[in-house]
Each structure stands twice: as structure tokens, then as C-alpha cells.
Interface confidence: low
């Protein structure tokens, strides 16, 4: 499903929108991106509170969210192959829109180390608790969901849209309705700040169509960092109300004339702006002309000002904004240099960690070290990376290539390895024979044997090893243990039927299998297929089943 209900909060120079709808993180990012934004950043406590506010707005409208816990994607992700860095607040995650490693974090629980698959962060809301502004949503990391598969996705997401500036909401001096349409395609009638390039439709009147007047305004940049609607005087004014309705729409003072008309005014130390509604301080620094962390310093007699930058920054050509000094140009790091606001940070490539001689040096991470290996079986450390391997009888599996999966030799591509019954076990296999037949010394063929009521023959003992020399079973290049990690063979018998020709008779009675010692007591009827052997005895009607285990200790039958 797509993104449904949305809520919006605009503050500072950004708007946050919250959406419900089960999307993967990639789909959510795409949705934000289509409207010119990104999944939201939460770079400070203040920003966390803005995001919480928009979520509170959404949750009050969204009756469908009945689960106790709810999650919403934000723009914090860690790419596949990038490892966790517990020393950083963001733990190696980074914001989708780029930007530095910010100091604020609010992790729900300690993160487990994994470098294998992409991980994404969502805000975890406990809906059973009141959403107090003091209790900010926790960060929860996990899989990023999969497109088109709602079951694996979470309840919603938060977008962030950044703007050059904002206009103040339009002030109505009488009854009317304002509808704002933002550049990110949201309509709202109550925004605390209205983003640059938004449109405002004002319908004046109290719903009586005859009296309704309409006005249309656009939030424009009137001068550098000065944004307004280009309207003059309060809107929807009515002699009937004068200053009594919303203070006449005036920012500060409202002065009423005898005829029901009124004017806006300002308190001492403030001046009325061109919109004839808003008041601004006469102090040149009060409009915060300096940006990017620059401090406004008043000139003599309070007439003009200069901007001053903190350490690690310098004024740009406008003399209003501070830009970071890029210390990385001097190549102070061994591998990666990250320029940070007011400084820099050395980082190591994936597979390396800080260490070694010298400032900013890096050394290889031994991913295979004890207690750290991501591999299920074998792990080989390489310079800057690692690779997993499996013991004989297993192949690499799993989306990240770290797991090992048993190879079923009984259904292998080369056809059955046994002449009669084949039992797959964890990491190996063994052959067996139908009742009345016994396993030949090569551990593969069956020969007619005396009918015996004793127990079936189990795996050959150590002293049997020598008998198998010269067997026709192909050898594998290296040996691996007979049993898998669980230590118990899984017996799934497959019957290779020894026969003289393809039309040899097959007994119609089901074959009752006896469990070999040391294997599970749950058995499946063997499936019967024709062997390719051109000769061999016909299968008898009854008797014992003889079983031998193929060793992988240098004897035949190994993988």
C-alpha cells in the first residue's frame, strides 16, 4: 500500500511530514524524494521534538494504528558492508541526505554487530504511553523492509523538506479561512511557519457565499533572507469586529478608528514592516542577519553590524554566513578524512579500524577473531575484508554468504552415489541396502546376503577403513567431518534400485526401513528410482536392510 494520512509541522527552515502506510525504507525515501525531500533527520533533541510533534499529529488522526508499538522510518541507514562503530553516537549509520556524524542519538537498545546486510532506523513509539514531549521516540534499527511486501514493512515514515526561509502565517483581521499549499504538495490551514514558494488561498467571510472574497498570495523572497506574502494590511477586515477579532490580525498593537477602521502599530524599539501587520526590532542584529553559526556584533551606536565566526570557520563572500574550513585539504589522515563543522575526523575504510602508529592511522579488522566471526563455519581474514568457507559436505548459503547449508549427496547432480539406498546426513551421507542384501566392502554396492533377523549393520568401525581402499567411489579433494554441527545424521533415504534392466520387477509392498544405530527413529519410505547399473541382482522380497556409513576420513565415500 502507498502512504496515506499525513501531518505537517513547519519550524525554523524545515517542514516535517508524517505518513502512515506500510512501505520499505527505500519506498519511503522515494516518496519523500518525489516531493523534494528526504526521510527525516533527527540531529538534535530539538529536531526530535519537531518530529515527535508531527507524529503526535498523525497519530491523533490515524485511528487505524491500534498496535501497542508503532515504527516510523527516518533517514538513518547503514550500507551493506559498513560495520558497526560503537564509539560513534550514530554507530556507523549515516543520514540519507548526507551530512556529518551528529552528536545526538536515542537508541532503543544496544546494537548487535553485523556488517553483512543493509540496516535502517525507525522511530519506535509506544502507543500505550502518552506521547509527552519529554519522552522522545527511541531509535530502533533493523532490516530495511522489502518493496512490494507489506508484511515485512513498518507502519509509516517521516519526511523532511528544507527551505531557504519561511513566511509568517497570514494574519486575518476578520472571519475567513486560509489554505496553504506547500511545495511538497501538502495543504493545511494551520502552519506555524509557511515555507518559501507556498501558495495561500484566503477566503474571507463567514461562509455566506455572497460576502466571500478570495485572495491568492505566494511566499516570496523579498530580499536576502526576508520572506513575505507581498500583502499589505490585515486580511478579511470587518468594521463589525475592528480590533476585537484576532487583534485585528496585527502582530503587536491594533489602533481602532471611530469608523470601525483600524491600523496596526508597534511597541517602542520595533518598526512596522511593509506588510503593515508585522513588527520587527530596530536593532539590526534582532533580525538575525548572520547565518551558519555566525554571531552578530553591533557596530558603534547600534547602527550597523558585522558577523563573526567561531573557531574552525570563516566568513563566506556574503560576509553573513560562516563556512567550514576544510582541514582535509592538508591530508591529515591515513585513509579517509571527514571534514566536520569546525574540525575534521579521520575514518578508516570498511574492514579497517583506527590503530597503528601515527595520528589517524588504520589497521585491518580481524573479522574472524574469536567471538567476532560472522561466519557459521570457516572464516578467513583478508586485508580489509574476510570471506567465509564451509566444511566438506556444506555449501555457502544465506543472502550474505555467511551460513553453511548441507549438500544432499543423494540427489546430487551426478546422480545417486549409492547403488541402492542413500541416506543424507549433516555434512555427509551413507549407503544402505534393501532387505536381503548386504553392503559390499566398497560401501556403495549391494550384494545378495543371507537373510538375517539381527540388527542392521551400522557404520563401519575404524578397522574397516582398510577394506575400502581401491573402491570405485570418487574421492573428494579434502576431507570434512562425517557429521554436521548438530552431531546427528538426518536420514532421508533415497533408493537406488539395483537391477539387470530397466524393466526389472519392483516389489509393490512398501519397504519397511530399520533405523541404523545413532540415527533418528523417524523414517520416511524410501523413494525408488532406477539405477543406471547394467547388472546386479534382482531385489528380494524381504529380509534385512544393511547400512554402511561413508567415511570422510580418507576412506571412500567422502565428499
Amino acid at each position: 500500500t502507498g502512504a496515506d494520512t499525513e501531518a505537517v509541522v513547519c519550524v525554523g527552515t524545515a517542514c516535517y511530514t508524517a505518513h502512515s502506510g506500510k512501505l520499505s525504507a527505500a519506498e519511503a525515501q522515494n516518496h519523500c524524494n518525489q516531493n523534494g525531500g528526504n526521510l527525516a533527520t533527527v540531529k538534535s533533541k530539538e529536531e526530535a521534538q519537531h518530529v515527535q510533534r508531527v507524529l503526535a499529529q498523525l497519530l491523533r488522526r490515524e485511528a487505524a494504528l491500534t498496535a501497542r508499538m508503532s515504527k516510523f522510518w527516518i533517514g538513518l541507514q547503514r550500507e551493506k558492508g559498513k560495520c558497526l562503530d560503537p564509539s560513534l553516537p550514530l554507530k556507523g549509520f549515516s543520514w540519507v541526505g548526507g551530512g556529518e556524524d551528529t552528536p545526538y542519538s536515542n537508541w532503543h537498545k544496544e546494537l548487535r554487530n553485523s556488517c553483512i546486510s543493509k540496516r535502517c532506523v525507525s522511530l519506535l513509539l509506544d502507543l500505550s504511553q502518552p506521547l509527552l514531549p519529554s519522552r522522545l521516540p527511541k531509535w530502533s534499527e533493523g532490516p530495511c523492509g522489502s518493496p512490494g511486501s507489506p508484511g515485512s514493512n513498518i507502519e509509516g515514515f517521516v519526511c523532511k523538506f528544507s527551505f531557504k526561509g519561511m513566511c509568517r502565517p497570514l494574519a486575518l483581521g476578520g472571519p475567513g479561512q486560509v489554505t496553504y499549499t506547500t511545495p511538497f504538495q501538502t495543504t493545511s490551514s494551520s502552519l506555524e511557519a509557511v515555507p518559501f514558494a507556498s501558495a495561500a488561498n484566503v477566503a474571507c467571510g463567514e461562509g455566506d457565499k455572497d460576502e466571500t472574497q478570495s485572495h491568492y498570495f505566494l511566499c516570496k523572497e523579498k530580499a536576502p533572507d526576508v520572506f513575505d506574502w507581498g500583502s499589505s494590511g490585515p486580511l478579511c477586515v470587518s468594521p463589525k469586529y475592528g480590533c476585537n477579532f484576532n487583534n485585528g490580525g496585527c502582530h503587536q498593537d491594533c489602533f481602532e478608528g471611530g469608523d470601525g477602521s483600524f491600523l496596526c502599530g508597534c511597541r517602542p524599539g520595533f518598526r512596522l514592516l511593509d506588510d503593515l501587520v508585522t513588527c520587527a526590532s530596530r536593532n539590526p542584529c534582532s533580525s538575525s542577519p548572520c547565518r551558519g553559526g555566525a554571531t552578530c556584533v553591533l557596530g558603534p551606536h547600534g547602527k550597523n553590524y558585522t558577523c563573526r565566526c567561531p573557531q574552525g570557520y570563516q566568513l563566506d563572500s556574503s560576509q553573513l554566513d560562516c563556512v567550514d574550513v576544510d582541514e582535509c585539504q592538508d591530508s591529515p589522515c591515513a585513509q579517509e578524512c571527514v571534514n566536520t563543522p569546525g574540525g575534521f575526523r579521520c575514518e578508516c575504510w570498511v574492514g579497517y579500524e583506527p590503530g597503528g602508529p601515527g595520528e589517524g592511522a588504520c589497521q585491518d579488522v580481524d573479522e574472524c577473531a574469536l567471538g567476532r566471526s560472522p561466519c557459521a563455519q570457516g572464516c578467513t581474514n583478508t586485508d580489509g575484508s574476510f570471506h567465509c568457507s564451509c566444511e566438506e559436505g556444506y555449501v555457502l548459503a544465506g543472502e550474505d554468504g555467511t551460513q553453511c547449508q548441507d549438500v544432499d549427496e543423494c540427489v546430487g547432480p551426478g546422480g545417486p552415489l549409492c547403488d541402492s539406498l542413500c541416506f543424507n546426513t549433516q555434512g555427509s551421507f551413507h549407503c544402505g541396502c534393501l532387505p536381503g542384501w548386504v553392503l559390499a566392502p566398497n560401501g556403495v554396492s549391494c550384494t545378495m546376503g543371507p537373510v538375517s533377523l539381527g540388527p542392521p549393520s551400522g557404520p563401519p568401525d575404524e578397522e574397516d577403513k582398510g577394506e575400502k581402499e581401491g573402491s570405485t567411489v570418487p574421492r573428494a579433494a579434502t576431507a570434512s567431518p562425517t557429521r554436521g554441527p548438530e552431531g546427528t545424521p538426518k536420514a532421508t533415504p533415497t533408493t537406488s534400485r539395483p537391477s539387470l534392466s530397466s524393466d526389472a520387477p519392483i516389489t509393490s509392498a512398501p519397504l519397511k526401513m530399520l533405523a541404523p544405530s545413532g540415527s533418528p527413529g523417524v523414517w520416511r519410505e524410501p523413494s525408488i528410482h532406477h539405477a543406471t547399473a547394467a547388472s546386479g541382482p534382482q531385489e528380494p522380497a524381504g529380509g534385512d536392510s544393511s547400512v554402511a556409513t561413508q567415511n570422510n576420513d580418507g576412506t571412500d565415500g567422502q565428499k
Epitope: 502518552p130 514531549p133 519529554s134 519522552r135 522522545l136 494551520s190 506555524e192
Partner: antibody, heavy 120, light 111 residues
């Protein structure tokens, strides 16, 4: 200066409803939450609920859920609290108070209070 | 609900005396490194007045003889040297969890 002014005292019969008003001035009404707190004679202060005037979102003390309704008129910078199904134990002084929007929502400005008497 | 227990419920003191009032919460009112405990002063027939917010921050305009401390469940309001206008009832309040709750009050009377 910042102030909250409440409506006058009320005398009501059990089972009736009362609607109190609180007019704000001297600050941007939509930038602060508005709360209602009551104090019965000799009792501790009791928080009843709050409203975000910018979007009319409300949170109530579960004790009063269903009986209390908080609303605002943004154009008049006024908050209202209506308490229904009145009983004698609702006799109290009712205060409106504002709190900051974020973080610790302490009550930095209070109205003078309205006395509500419920008596048959 | 978080229950706030104030002690003592009343005390008699003289002008110039140091007074300490305690407030104990039934569970922690700390969250993300902040303590959501506030103190108010109320005089008869008047509305409460904020003195201290977030356990130890003095509200602007409040005399510096008032101070607050504590974290978790135990909090203290101290008046270093009582003045005439300080004889009143003092309430603690937690804003960490809904419903926001108040203590039972401590009445400070003239000895």
C-alpha cells in the same frame, strides 16, 4: 504583560454541566499548551487535561475522560473547559495554566482561578 | 499514576531560618538525563506560582534564596533564609508522565 483571565464563579446543580473560559493575552496564544487544573477545598492540585491551541490536540487525565472537554477559539485567544455530569465533589477552584510547547511542561503562568460550586 | 509524597505536611519557622521540604515520587521522574520535577508556591486565595522547574532551575524573577535539588525519586526544595512573603503552601509536581500529578503540599507557617 502575559496574563490569563478566567470567567466568573459558577453555581451548578448535580448532573448539570459547566463551561469555563480562559482568555490569554501578552503572548502568542498558539505557541504554548493550555492546561486546566483544579483544587477542591483542602485537597491537592489535580491536573485535568491540556490542549495545543495551534491544532486543538487534547490530552486528558483518564480520571475525567468522557466528562471533560477542552476547546479553544484561536481568533479570541481563549481556551474553554467544559465539565459535565457534575457532582458535589467537583466543587473546587478551577485554574487555567500555560506550559511551554516542548520538554518539561511546567506551568509558568496561571489564571487567578474560577470557583465552581456544585450543590442541590 | 505517579504519587508524590511531601514531607513535612506543615512546619513552623521564623524569618531568617533555613527550611527544607522534600518530595518523594512513587517511581522515577527522570527521562533522558533530565528530572521532570517542579515546585510551586501558593498563597491563600491565589493561584500557584512557579518557583523551580526541572528539579533545580530557578524560574526568572524568583529570589535566589529558593533552590531545588534531587533526581530519580527524591527531591528537595530549600529556602536558605525565610522572609515574610515566603509563608505559604509549597507543592511539588511531576511532568514526566500522564497524568501530571502534584504533591499534597507543605504549609510553612510563622513560628
Amino acid at each position: 504583560q502575559v496574563q490569563l483571565v478566567e470567567s466568573g464563579a459558577e453555581v451548578k446543580k448535580p448532573g448539570a454541566s459547566v463551561k469555563l473560559s480562559c482568555k490569554a493575552s501578552g503572548y502568542t496564544f498558539t505557541s504554548y499548551w493550555m492546561h486546566w487544573v483544579r483544587q477542591a477545598p483542602g485537597q491537592r492540585l489535580e491536573w485535568m487535561g491540556e490542549i495545543d491551541p495551534s491544532a486543538s490536540y487534547t490530552y486528558y487525565n483518564q480520571k475525567f475522560k468522557g466528562r471533560v472537554t477542552i476547546t479553544v477559539d484561536k481568533s479570541a485567544s481563549t481556551a474553554y473547559m467544559e465539565l459535565s455530569s457534575l457532582r458535589s465533589e467537583d466543587t473546587a477552584v478551577y485554574y487555567c495554566a500555560r506550559s511551554v510547547y516542548y520538554g518539561n511542561k511546567y506551568f509558568d503562568v496561571w489564571g487567578p482561578g474560577t470557583t465552581v460550586t456544585v450543590s442541590s | 499514576d505517579i504519587v508524590l509524597t511531601q514531607s513535612p505536611s506543615s512546619l513552623s519557622a521564623s524569618v531568617g531560618q533555613r527550611v527544607t521540604i522534600t518530595c518523594r515520587a512513587s517511581q522515577s521522574v527522570d527521562y533522558a538525563g533530565d528530572s521532570y520535577m517542579n515546585w510551586y508556591q501558593q498563597k491563600p486565595g491565589k493561584a500557584p506560582k512557579l518557583l523551580i522547574y526541572a528539579a533545580s532551575n530557578l524560574e526568572s524573577g524568583v529570589p535566589s534564596r529558593f533552590s531545588g535539588s534531587g533526581s530519580g525519586t527524591d527531591f528537595t526544595l530549600t529556602v536558605s533564609s525565610l522572609e515574610d512573603e515566603d509563608f505559604a503552601t509549597y507543592y511539588c509536581q511531576q511532568t514526566n508522565e500522564d497524568p501530571r500529578t502534584f504533591g499534597g503540599g507543605t504549609k510553612v507557617e510563622i513560628k
